[in-house]
């Protein structure tokens, strides 16, 4: 059983969203007492994989040499020290992209869009997808997260932004993936530029802030107002 | 009945390649880790190394890393183990042996019956 | 790597007798100490793992115990049957590594 020695952290290099046939590092890292390190892999029944610590013994290294679907979904690990078994690490949730085609991102009516108007993201794919995510760069997570009812696929995932702040502007992308799996999706849609004009009196400043900064409104998720689109997709926000 | 059959002897010259393999039966082959152990005729046993099925990860002992690959077909629920640049020093029976996690512990609970490997010219 | 010494390399005991062999490493394994039987021409066996815990389907006059680098395979009561070559196994660390095994005769 797992004794109370403190959980390890865990974590990927470059990051943990990576695209098809490039390399990734998984990381453990424990104490200077680890004699094993232990990862698992959701669903596994046996350890994914298992390593002697690296000296100074706190941390084992885990390498992925170019992903693939395989390797894509929701990891944990332990270490081993003299007095047993840690407790489990958080999940690290191993994203790939490239897994289909990548879809089409717009702006309707227009990426030039006037503050305090609103606009909507249309994600488009070729082929019939269940799972829309609409990301903005530099942002730490996923804006905006649709999934369709029931299994129903779709072509495409309307994202709408109503009133439009400063705020919103900036760069996006989308994705679409299958339901069956989380953890794959598609190549990244083209970037899209929205630009914010300002004729209404913004109620908050642009943020000026670089990636090592606290976060700031682009870090929060979008909450757009209006119905949900007809398009039979329910939205999560994470 | 949970089975690991391994090939046949082989004769092999010094300097050659060989490619042993267990046949694992009676089983989800990608749920249990595969072990590959060294017996020198009248001499103890040597660890080389393991195997994960069901994504191809390897832990070698350093002394074998050079000598011993380690592989799996998924679709025939077979483990390999191919010995390189042979000499007499391998001549051997090469045993595998899965390997059963009970919680956070582990044991070897099958073996394959081993294959004899002679190296000579 | 961590040597692992078994004792005695080989030996003679009567059918009935308690015998123990005892296998030391060279550093603290922590417990994870398996022992095996071997018999002519076959494949080993395994008795026991985490240094006391029976395999389903060994007798139980076989017994393990020991902790730290000293550890210990009771047999309570030979039987014929118990003839071959034991050897311990540490997969405490990388690489696992096998004690040079004891030879048990029957007298």
């Known amino acids: 059983q797992a004794g109370p020695l403190p959980k390890p952290t865990l974590w990927a290099e470059p990051g943990s969203v990576i695209s098809w046939g490039n390399s990734v590092t998984i990381w453990c890292q424990g104490t200077l007492e680890a004699r094993e390190y232990r990862l698992d892999k959701e669903e596994s029944p046996a350890p994914w994989d298992r390593q002697n610590p690296l000296e100074p013994k706190n941390k084992a290294r885990f390498s992925i040499p170019s992903m693939t679907e395989d390797y894509a979904g929701r990891y944990r690990c332990y270490y081993r020290s003299p007095v047993g078994w840690s407790q489990p690490s958080d999940p690290l949730e191993l994203v790939m992209t490239g897994a289909y085609s990548k879809p089409t991102l717009s702006a309707l009516p227009s990426p030039l869009v006037t503050s305090g108007k609103s606009v909507t993201l249309l994600c488009q794919s070729r082929s019939p997808m269940d799972t829309f995510l609409l990301i903005k760069e530099r942002a730490a997570h996923p804006l905006l997260h649709l999934r369709s009812e029931h299994g129903a696929q779709q072509h495409q995932a309307e994202f709408p932004m109503s009133p439009v702040t400063s705020v919103h502007g900036g760069t996006y992308r989308c994705f679409s993936s299958h339901g069956f799996s989380h953890y794959l999706l598609s190549h990244p849609s083209d970037p899209l530029e929205l630009i914010v004009s300002g004729s209404l009196e913004d109620p908050r400043p642009s943020p000026t802030r670089s990636v090592s900064t606290a976060a700031g409104p682009e870090d929060q998720p979008l909450m757009p107002t209006g119905s949900v689109p007809h398009s039979g997709l329910r939205r999560h926000w994470e | 009945e949970v089975q690991l059959q391994q090939s046949g002897t082989e004769l092999v010259k010094p300097g050659a390649s060989v490619k042993l393999s267990c046949k694992a039966s009676g089983y989800t082959f990608t749920n249990y880790w595969m072990h590959w152990v060294k017996q020198r005729p009248g001499q103890g046993l040597e660890w080389i190394g393991e195997?994960?099925?069901?994504?191809?990860?390897?832990n070698y002992n350093e002394k074998f890393k050079t000598k011993a690959t380690l592989t799996v077909d998924k679709s025939s629920s077979t483990a390999y183990m191919q010995l390189s640049s042979l000499t007499s020093e391998d001549s051997a029976v090469y045993y595998c042996?899965?390997?059963?996690?009970?919680?956070?512990?582990?044991?070897?609970?099958?073996w394959g019956a081993g294959t004899t490997v002679t190296v000579s010219s | 790597d961590i040597v692992l010494t078994q004792s005695p390399s080989s030996m003679y005991a009567s059918l009935g007798e308690r015998v123990t062999i005892t296998c030391k490493a060279s550093?603290?394994?922590?417990?994870?100490l398996s022992w095996f039987q071997q018999k002519p021409g076959k494949s080993p066996k395994t008795l026991i793992y985490r240094a006391n815990r029976l395999l389903d389907g060994v007798p139980s006059r076989f017994s393990g115990g020991g902790s730290g680098q000293d550890y210990s395979l009771t047999i309570s009561s030979l039987e014929h049957e118990d003839m071959g070559i034991y050897y311990c196994?540490?997969?405490?660390?990388?690489?696992?590594?096998f004690g040079g095994g004891t030879k048990l005769e029957i007298k």
């Open positions: 196994l540490q997969c405490d660390e990388f690489p696992h590594t």
């Open positions: 042996a899965r390997s059963t996690y009970y919680g956070y512990d582990w044991y070897f609970d099958v």
């Open positions: 550093q603290d394994i922590n417990s994870y």
């Open positions: 195997i994960n099925p069901s994504n191809g990860r390897t």
